[in-house]
């Protein structure tokens, strides 16, 4: 008796497709030794047709895989387009050879059933509409037109023309005739149910002169797609019910015992468990829809069902398309922080991974929100606008060929609390949700910049001061001017720097920043922050004013400011300036062309700043001080 | 909620045959694997077979101990699901259970009982020596 099992027999149709599942022993030797899937010849020998080695054979080409799923001790081989060629005996089995362990599978596929010349074959899905299609001759244009269904030797009537209808296909079946057809009717079964498949006989007039039609019908439970995804993935239900259901409310469900709980409806229903990671998008109006969820969880494997009811709950008899998802532990996706905590007027700096095959990439940040299906508007991104509300105290940091993006956030507030995507316009698997929890600050920030109330005069010069605490000491300190493309870094001086670290004076740490002389063009935000290498910390900001010099205020030589600004020895002065050009950058539509359910993109990248070169010339001067 | 009731159990001799029926009613759209499970006297239940259908495919599986002599087939119409027996031995005696499931394939395992939301409430299969 073999240690391995699975179906002993398989039967299906041509055309169709199988899921054959076979269970090993769980030893650790079984999980990584050799899958294989043979065909037993009459000569004994069993020809391998796929195999967890990467073998194919020629005639499974472009129709066959084998997973192995480790954590569950088991392999699947999937097989499409079937033919009665495959009708045969085989073998799935484990081991170097195909002699190792092993479980024989009987594979039978048949055509489509035949039935007498007079029989009519519908085949439908379940919760569809099948039309039946009764002839007759005129001589019974008149009498009574019925549909029955063939129960053992009995035909239990369904429906008549004389208005009778069967108590199980009330409201369901209708029987009618179209235009000035004197020799045809119809009989429209609607909702279909398993139950509802067999051999139908319709039937216009009685006794012998009695004209009669077969009608099989066929009612098929839907076959799920198997859907294959690593951990902190994500994954896209597609679903296409149908124009007859354009107008009922959709749905996503996960099965569950006898039921099918509710992950998502467009009436608003949302399971908690998917909370800040899934997007619910109407793709047209015939009824199509998507369903998007990210950061998915071990837990997340399961059989999915899409589905629509005026209710937005799972009906028997209404159409449904199944999926059965896998996640894969073995993932290439990093781990990285699901939720990140910030407290109010403070910062974060949240790190996106991206494939890092794709560092030419457009990278996104958008905020979930919870409203109707849910939606994620973008707030910034390499080509975006940076959303209103969100200037001067957000930005995105891509660090090319590191495989991740760092997106800045400062000026914290309680209502920046929620759920917020990283995804690129590539590899759309890399699409990471986290959740930011803001609390109350409890005490004052690390970073602190003087002076606060940021008046620059034109033509004169100003720096501006920022305070960090001797914990950031060994860390970069760097002042940057926001733009809506980004934070560019710009000469700065730190003055703790020079002290040994042993002696650290918590109230001389001192990263400043010289305009020098003030522009108009130096208005605007400014970033003081700490970053290790491509690793962003805190980040604290300012808004400058500039302003005309006023009558009677008085002037100051810049080279006065500088001498003044000379108390420490060894201090050298830097000089250096930023020059911003303005153009128009669009928005990748490749981004948005499969995805519409990351929302309100499009509109942002109307009006996007592109950066000229942040290193270059003209407006701004650092100077040491 | 579905409801399983089985039928067909009775007295045998050895070597003869025994039909099971397990007729399904309620909520039977959601049911896509229906198991035989047995309990003999004083020992543990024991898988049997099942059928998983998917689409137009169905899977069918067999403990080691009735392969060759146990079928399990289903009529769709009447939501019914049979266990042909053949070759009855005494080893076979036992309350026979019918199970089902709405989760289809791949799914759980089918010889585990945990694999299984619906229970019927068994019928006994006695075949004397």
């Known amino acids: 008796q073999s240690p391995i099992f699975g179906p002993q027999d398989v039967s299906s149709i041509e055309g169709n497709s199988v899921s054959i599942t076979c269970y090993y022993p769980d030893t650790s030797v079984n999980r990584h030794t050799r899958k294989y899937w043979c065909r037993q010849g009459a000569n004994g020998y069993c020809a391998t047709l796929i195999s967890s080695n990467g073998y194919l054979s020629k005639e499974y080409s472009g129709r066959a895989s084998l997973i192995n799923f480790p954590e569950n001790s088991t392999f699947v081989i999937n097989i499409a387009h079937l033919t009665q060629e495959d009708t045969g005996s085989y073998k799935c089995g484990l081991g170097t050879t195909n002699r190792g362990l092993f479980f024989d599978v009987s594979l039978e596929v048949s055509q489509v059933p035949e039935f007498p010349n007079d029989t009519h074959v519908y085949t439908k899905d379940i919760g569809r509409t099948v039309t039946i299609e009764c002839r007759f001759k005129e001589g019974n244009a008149h009498s009574k037109k019925s549909l029955c269904k063939k129960r053992g030797e009995a035909c239990e009537v369904v429906i008549d023309s004389t208005e009778y209808v069967d108590p199980s296909y009330k409201d369901r079946a209708i029987l009618f005739m179209k235009g000035t057809s004197r020799d045809i009717f119809y009989v429209n079964i609607s909702h279909l149910i398993p139950s509802d498949a067999g051999l139908y006989v319709c039937q216009a007039g009685e006794g012998p002169s009695a004209d009669k039609n077969n009608a099989d019908l066929q009612v098929l439970e839907p076959e799920p797609e198997l859907l294959y995804k690593d951990l902190r993935s994500s994954v896209t239900f597609e679903c296409d019910l149908g124009r007859e259901v354009a107008n009922d409310a959709k749905y996503l469900c996960r099965k569950n015992k006898e039921t099918c709980d509710v992950i998502i409806n467009t009436l608003g229903k949302r399971d908690p468990a998917f909370e800040g990671r899934i997007l619910l998008t109407p793709r047209d109006d015939n009824g199509r829809f998507s369903v998007l969820i990210t950061g998915l969880r071990k837990e997340d494997a399961g059989h999915y069902q899409c589905g629509a009811h005026s209710s937005g709950l799972p009906q028997e008899g209404w159409p449904v398309q199944a999926w059965q998802l896998f996640v894969n532990e073995e993932s290439t996706i990093p781990n990285s922080r699901s939720v990140v905590k910030g407290v109010t007027g403070g910062s974060v700096a949240i790190v996106c991974p991206y494939n890092p095959k794709e560092s030419s990439s457009l990278k996104y940040w958008c905020h979930w929100e919870a409203d109707e299906n849910g939606r994620c508007p973008v707030l910034v991104g390499t080509q975006a606008l940076v959303q209103e509300g969100y200037e001067g105290r957000l930005a995105l940091f891509d660090q090319p060929g590191s495989g991740a993006y760092t997106v800045i956030l400062n000026q914290l507030t309680t209502q920046d609390s929620g759920f917020y995507w990283c995804l690129t316009d590539g590899d759309s698997r890399w699409r990471t949700t986290i959740e930011l929890q803001v609390a109350e600050a409890t005490k004052k920030p690390d970073l602190e910049v003087t002076p606060q109330n940021a008046t620059a005069v034109i033509g004169e010069t100003f720096t501006i001061s920022c305070h960090y605490p001797c914990k950031f000491y060994s860390q970069e300190k760097y002042w940057c001017k926001w733009s809506n493309d980004g934070c560019h870094i710009l000469p700065s001086h730190d003055e703790g720097a020079r002290q040994s670290s042993v002696s650290c004076d918590q109230s001389s740490q001192i990263v400043s920043m010289t305009l020098n002389p003030v522009k108009k063009e130096d208005e605007g935000w400014y970033w003081c922050g700490v970053k290790e290498g491509q690793v962003y910390g805190e980040t604290t900001a300012i808004y400058v004013a500039v302003e005309e010099r006023t009558r009677g205020s008085p002037h100051i030589n810049p080279t006065d400011a500088n001498a003044r600004a000379k108390d420490a020895p060894e201090e050298e002065a830097m000089e250096s300036s930023v020059r911003e050009d303005e153009n128009k950058a669009n928005l990748d539509p490749r981004l948005f062309a499969d995805e519409r359910e990351i929302q309100n993109a499009g509109d942002q990248a109307q009006e996007n700043r592109a950066s000229g070169n942040a290193g270059s010339a003209g407006g701004q001067s650092g100077s040491s001080k | 909620q579905v409801q399983l009731v089985e039928s067909g159990g009775g007295l045998v001799q050895t070597g003869g045959s025994l039909r099971l029926s397990c007729a399904a009613s309620?909520?039977?759209?959601?049911?896509?694997?229906v198991g035989w499970f047995r309990q003999a006297p004083g020992k543990e239940r024991e898988f049997v077979a099942a059928?998983?259908?998917?689409?137009?495919?169905?899977?069918?599986y067999a403990a080691d101990s009735v392969k060759g002599r146990f079928t399990i087939s289903r009529d769709n119409a009447e939501n019914t699901v049979y266990l042909q027996m053949n070759s009855l031995k005494p080893e076979d005696t036992a309350v026979y259970y019918c199970?089902?499931?709405?989760?289809?394939?791949?799914?759980?395992?089918?010889?585990?009982?945990?694999?299984?939301?619906?229970w019927g409430q068994g019928t006994l299969v006695t075949v004397s020596s």
């Open positions: 309620g909520r039977t759209f959601s049911v896509y694997r």
């Open positions: 199970a089902a499931d709405p989760l289809g394939l791949p799914g759980p395992d089918v010889r585990v009982e945990g694999g299984y939301r619906h």
């Open positions: 059928v998983i259908w998917s689409g137009a495919s169905t899977y069918k």
